[in-house]
């Protein structure tokens, strides 16, 4: 939702978390700002507390539940309002009719470990972290290699079009240390966005055997 | 093998109810959506509703919500449709089927159901 | 609720001819639009989700594509088990609902 220079963003995780990010130009600094989530069709609500991230916007986080717990359906429309204390009253600086599963940003996955790992090539494994059951197998991955003397961003992405929670990493160069993210969208959703990267898991390759041609 | 087998033709006079069962294997009924989807001759597919088995939730289709009951039982893997006030335009197949919210990616084979005094 | 509309409602082609179905809903649904085939005495069978993604198991000669709110289902080169009934179905406002089909049989 886009009010003039306003600008007000959120993800759903699927699970029982909204993540907001509230900006606009020429807000005040130490002003006291929330998000108020009221879900359509049911009893509860949810408030989190606006900080500030950057110089002119502000981020916080919906807890709805227990990291696991299924808090909205795919037919669940809530109300988003930005409110900012005024004296002694709030003001609405923002609102969206948020649809949970059209705008989803699932958690980086988690627990990252090297399965086996040869001379050229390693095969790597990866877990989901609060994702929905309602995906099924419906889930896509991109992963990147971090080789010596690149960047990530000079890391070529390869894509997984299905849930395949490994990868085998092939024409690796012996006895060299790499790194190795990976992340996971659904295939679900109009606004739907790559979750973030999963922390690098850094692996060394197996040195080639001494007099062996490689 | 995901398999959907659900229970057998029944005939119903109009006012009464029919309860039809979706026996589920080969996945993980713990944590999957199974929906209930009318096929009437006239009226062509219609979804009823489905039900979340990890947390017993239910969502219901506003043209059924008044009539229809949808339960699961976990310690059987089955799934139950209860379809109460019975009218002759209830005469349909009606289908059990496993999916996420958005589509149905396997279907149990259909009950046929007839309403006639 | 959204009224999806395919045409034609049936559809003569001959084996190894492409065929092309047409699905259109009554208001903006993204890509929220999958397809069924649905045979004789059977249960529906999952064919494409969000409009153009393919299920796994599927024959490759079955794509999907979007303009708008008008979805089309091609099938390149039919084989005689394709003769069957396609039904295309949105999932963007609840209730989710279904065309009424088209019967695609042998010409």
């Known amino acids: 939702a886009v009010n003039g220079t306003s600008r007000f963003t959120c993800f759903y995780n699927s699970r029982a978390n909204i993540s907001c990010v509230w900006s606009q130009d020429g807000a005040l600094q130490d002003t006291s700002c929330q998000v108020h989530a009221w879900p359509d069709r049911r009893r509860w609500n949810q408030t989190c507390e606006l900080l500030p991230v950057s110089q002119a916007s502000w981020a916080c986080n919906l807890i709805l539940g227990t990291p696991d717990s299924q808090k909205l359906t795919a037919v669940d429309i809530v109300t988003l309002r930005v409110m900012c204390r005024e004296g002694v009253r709030w003001r609405m600086m923002a609102i969206q009719d948020f649809k949970p599963f059209e705008n989803l940003r699932l958690m980086a996955p988690i627990s990252l470990q090297v399965v086996h790992v040869e001379t050229h090539r390693c095969n790597i494994s990866w877990k989901i972290s609060q994702a929905s059951h309602y995906f099924e197998r419906h889930l896509e991955f991109e992963a990147r290699t971090l080789s010596p003397g690149h960047t990530w961003e000079e890391a070529p992405l390869m894509t997984l079009k299905q849930k395949q929670e490994w990868i085998c990493l092939e024409t690796l160069t012996p006895d060299t240390q790499y790194e190795f993210q990976v992340r996971v969208k659904p295939l679900q959703g109009e606004f739907t966005t790559w979750s973030p990267w999963s922390q690098p898991l850094a692996f060394r390759t197996k040195p080639a055997a001494l007099g062996k041609d490689t | 093998e995901v398999q959907l087998v659900q229970s057998g033709a029944e005939v119903k006079k109009p006012g009464a109810t029919v309860k039809i069962s979706c026996k589920v294997s080969?996945?993980?009924?713990?944590?999957?959506?199974i929906h209930w989807v009318q096929q009437a001759p006239g009226k062509g597919l219609e979804w009823m509703g489905w039900?979340?088995?990890?947390?017993?939730?239910?969502e219901y289709a506003p043209g059924f919500q008044d009539r229809v009951t949808i339960t699961a039982d976990t310690s059987t893997d089955t799934a139950y449709m209860e379809l109460s006030s019975l009218r002759s335009e209830d005469t349909a197949v009606y289908y059990c089927?496993?999916?996420?919210?958005?589509?149905?990616?396997?279907w149990g084979q259909g009950t046929t159901v007839t309403v006639s005094s | 609720e959204i009224v999806m509309t395919q045409s034609p409602a049936t559809l003569s082609v001959s084996p190894g001819e492409r065929a092309t179905l047409s699905c259109r809903a009554s208001?903006?649904?993204?890509?929220?639009l999958h397809w069924y085939q649905q045979k004789p005495g059977q249960a529906p069978r999952l064919l494409i989700i969000?409009?153009?993604q393919s299920i796994s198991g599927i024959p490759a000669r079955f794509s999907g594509s979007r303009s708008g709110t008008e979805f089309t289902l091609t099938i390149s080169s039919l084989q005689s088990e394709d003769f069957a009934v396609y039904f295309c179905?949105?999932?963007?406002?609840?209730?989710?609902?279904f065309g009424q089909g088209t019967k695609l049989e042998i010409k």
């Open positions: 179905q949105q999932s963007n406002n609840w209730p989710w609902t």
């Open positions: 080969g996945f993980n009924f713990k944590d999957s959506l």
């Open positions: 208001q903006i649904i993204s890509n929220n």
């Open positions: 089927a496993r999916g996420g919210p958005w589509f149905l990616s396997y």
């Open positions: 039900i979340d088995s990890e947390n017993g939730e239910t």
């Open positions: 969000y409009g153009l």
